[in-house]
Amino acid sequence: LKGQEFAPSHQQVYAPLRADGDKPRAHLTVVRQTPTQHLKNQFPALHWEHELGLAFTKNRMNYTNKFLLIPESGDYFVYSQVTFRGMTSECSEIRQAGRPNKPDSITVVITKVTDSYPEPTQLLMGTKSVCEVGSNWFQPIYLGAMFSLQEGDKLMVNVSDISLVDYTKEDKTFFGAFLL
Amino acid sequence: LKGQEFAPSHQQVYAPLRADGDKPRAHLTVVRQTPTQHLKNQFPALHWEHELGLAFTKNRMNYTNKFLLIPESGDYFVYSQVTFRGMTSECSEIRQAGRPNKPDSITVVITKVTDSYPEPTQLLMGTKSVCEVGSNWFQPIYLGAMFSLQEGDKLMVNVSDISLVDYTKEDKTFFGAFLL
Amino acid sequence: LKGQEFAPSHQQVYAPLRADGDKPRAHLTVVRQTPTQHLKNQFPALHWEHELGLAFTKNRMNYTNKFLLIPESGDYFVYSQVTFRGMTSECSEIRQAGRPNKPDSITVVITKVTDSYPEPTQLLMGTKSVCEVGSNWFQPIYLGAMFSLQEGDKLMVNVSDISLVDYTKEDKTFFGAFLL
C-alpha cells in the first residue's frame, strides 16, 4: 500500500497514513500557583494539573515542570485561556500634572522553548488594558492557533502577574495542544 | 493491513485508520431565545439553529433540545462564542456607605451531561465583569478546548443572562464541536 | 484496501483515507498596513505576512492579495486574533443634554468570498464596545470556528478601523485556517 494511492487528481504524494487516536494531545488545567523564582526579564510561567479532572496527556505528549513536551514534529493547534481577577484598578485617575497614568494590564503569552536555540519564541500573546472604576473585576484572555513544532520543543504559558490568575476552577484557566 | 505498519521508529500500535471526512462535526448558530423553564440552580441553556445558513451537523452528530449529542467516543475540540449586549451597567455606582456594589457580569459555560452521572460537568467557562458607565455595551466571550468525550455525552451552552445574548447574526453567537 | 474496512460497527462507508501531513494549512501574521482604497460599505481587509517568522502556507493553501485561497473542499477550522490599541475613548461622557453618545467599538470579521456568489458571507464576527476613561487602551478579539468551504473560496479578515490594529508583533495579530 502506497500513501499516494488516495491522492486526488492533482497527484500529490502523501505522507504515511496515520490513525487519529494515537496523536499527541494534552489538555492541562489550572492549579494554585506557588511562589517560585522567575527568570529575569520574562513573565512567570504557570504550572498545571495534567491528570486529574478534565486534564490529560496522551500519546507521548508529556508535561513536566511547567512545560508541555512535543514528542513528534508536525503542525499543532495550541490554545490557552487564563482568567484574571483583581481588585479595583485606578488607571483612569489623572496623575502627574494631568497626564493619565499607564494603564494596568494583563497579558498571556504562549512561549516555545527550543533547547538548541538560545531565545524563547513567543507564539501567541493576548494583552489587555484593565481600567475598571470602583469595583473588583474579572475577565478571561483566550488564545489559540496552529504552529509547526519540532520534536523536543517545549511549550509554556506565561502571564504578566501570577497573583491575578483565577485558579479556582479547571474550566476557567487551561492550556492545551494537539497534533493535527 | 495492520494499523501499526506506519508506526514511527518508537514502534507504537495505532488505532484503526479513519477517513477525516466522516467524523462527527457540528457548527450551530444563534436564534432568538424565547422564555422557557430552566433547570433549577443552573444557568439557562441556549437553543440553536442546526441546519440553516452556516449551521450544520454531520456524521451522526445530532442536535436536539439544546444539546449536541456525541455519537462516538474520542477527543473533540469544542468551542463557542456568545456575544452579549446590554444597556447601561451601574456597577460602578458607589452604594451602601461608599462600598461599590458587586459588578454585573456575563458568563458562558459549555457543559457536558452524561446520563449515567448525576451532575453536569462544566468543561469551559468564560466569565467577565461588566462595568460600563453611561452607555450601551456589547462584547463577545469566546471559548474552545479539547476534551475526551464518550458516546452518549451531551453538550450544551449555558449563559448567565439569556436576555443579554445578541441573537441578531449567525456569526456573532455560535457553538460547535468536532472529533479530532 | 477499501476505506470502509475500518468502519465501526454501525457500518458507514468512509471517504478515501488521507494523510494528515498533506492537508492545506496556513498561519498568517500581522504586518504594518499600508493605506489602500477600501470597498464601499465594507470594513477594510488586512494584509498579512505568509512566510517569515511564524507564518506559513502549505499543501496548496495559498495567500494572495489579502485572501487565503481554499484549494480543496472540506471542513476547515478558521481563526484569527486582532489586537487593537487606541487613545482614550470618551464614549461615557454625558453629551447632548445628558444623552450618552454611542460607544466607540472595535470589530473583526472573517469573511468568505465565493466568486460565483455576488455577496461576501460573514463567517465570524467579534465586536466590542470600547469605553475606556482617561487612558490609552489595548485589547484582543479572538475568533475561531469550523466551516464547510468549497474549493476556490477565499477568506479575508476585515476590521472596523485599520488604524487601531496593533501590527507590532506577530503573536498579537494573526489569521489561520486548516483542513480538518
Partner: antibody, heavy 118, light 107 residues
Framework: QVQLVQSGAEVKKPGASVKVSCKAS????????MHWVRQAPGQGLEWMGW????????NYVQKFQGRVTMTRDTSINTAYMELNNLKSDDTAVYYC???????????WGQGTMVTVSS | DIQMTQSPSSVSASVGGRVTITCRAS??????LAWYQQKPGKAPNLLIY???SLQSGVPSRFSGSGSGTDFTLTISSLQPEDFATYYC?????????FGGGTKVEIK
C-alpha cells in the same frame, strides 16, 4: 405556556400611590427582564423601565425617576410596579411584558387600568 | 432619548390591499427595532423583531425591513383581522422608546 396575569383595576386620588402586580408562569421568572409599559386613554405606548428579577436590579426612565419603584418576589414569581404621588395624567393602562431578549417583548399581561381622579 | 417618528398616523385600506408603514429613528439604531400590533382593549402583540425577523406564529404577509434610521413594516395583503394600530419600538439604547402609532382602518 407563558402567562402574565396582572392585578385588577384601581381608582386612586391624586397624591396617592398604586402598586400593580404581575404574576408570571410557564417560564423561569428569574431568567428574563420584566418591562413595564403604560398607555393613557387614546394615546400611544410609553415605556417606564425594567427590573431584572434575578438580581432585583432596575432601570427607570428619567421621567419616572423618584416616583416609580419596581420590585419582585421570586418566591411567588411576581413583579410589582409602584407609582407614587399620582397625578391625573397617570391615568392609563399599565402593562407588564417579558421576552427572550431585552429588545422586544414576546409576552404581555392583560393590563391594569389605573384611574386617578379627585 | 431616541425619538421614533411613525408615518402615517393613520391609513385607510381595503381587504387584500397593501399597506406600508414607516418608522424613522432620530439616530442610528442598527437593527434594534420591533413592530407590534394592538387591537382595542388588548395588549400589544409582537410581530417583527430585529427589524426584519418574523415572530413565530405571525402570518408571512407581515414583513419588516430597514436598518440604521429608516424602517418599514409592510402588510402585503390585508386581512380583516389586520385592522389595528401598529407601533414601532427601538431597543438600541436606554430608554426604549415607541413610535406614536399608525392606525390601519377599513376603507
Amino acid at each position: 405556556q407563558v402567562q402574565l396575569v396582572q392585578s385588577g383595576a384601581e381608582v386612586k386620588k391624586p397624591g396617592a400611590s398604586v402598586k400593580v402586580s404581575c404574576k408570571a408562569s410557564g417560564y423561569t421568572f428569574t431568567g428574563y427582564y420584566m418591562h413595564w409599559v403604560r398607555q393613557a386613554p387614546g394615546q400611544g405606548l410609553e415605556w417606564m423601565g425594567w427590573i431584572k428579577p434575578k438580581s432585583g436590579g432596575t432601570n427607570y426612565v428619567q421621567k419616572f425617576q423618584g416616583r416609580v419603584t419596581m420590585t419582585r418576589d421570586t418566591s411567588i414569581n411576581t413583579a410589582y410596579m409602584e407609582l407614587n404621588n399620582l397625578k391625573s395624567d397617570d391615568t392609563a393602562v399599565y402593562y407588564c411584558a417579558t421576552g427572550g431578549s431585552q429588545d422586544a417583548s414576546d409576552f404581555w399581561g392583560q393590563g391594569t387600568m389605573v384611574t386617578v381622579s379627585s | 432619548d431616541i425619538q421614533m417618528t411613525q408615518s402615517p398616523s393613520s391609513v385607510s385600506a381595503s381587504v387584500g390591499g397593501r399597506v406600508t408603514i414607516t418608522c424613522r429613528a432620530s439616530q442610528d439604531i442598527s437593527i434594534w427595532l420591533a413592530w407590534y400590533q394592538q387591537k382595542p382593549g388588548k395588549a400589544p402583540n409582537l410581530l417583527i423583531y430585529a427589524a426584519s425577523s418574523l415572530q413565530s406564529g405571525v402570518p408571512s404577509r407581515f414583513s419588516g425591513s430597514g436598518s440604521g434610521t429608516d424602517f418599514t413594516l409592510t402588510i402585503s395583503s390585508l386581512q380583516p383581522e389586520d385592522f389595528a394600530t401598529y407601533y414601532c419600538q427601538q431597543a438600541d439604547s436606554f430608554p426604549l422608546t415607541f413610535g406614536g402609532g399608525t392606525k390601519v382602518e377599513i376603507k
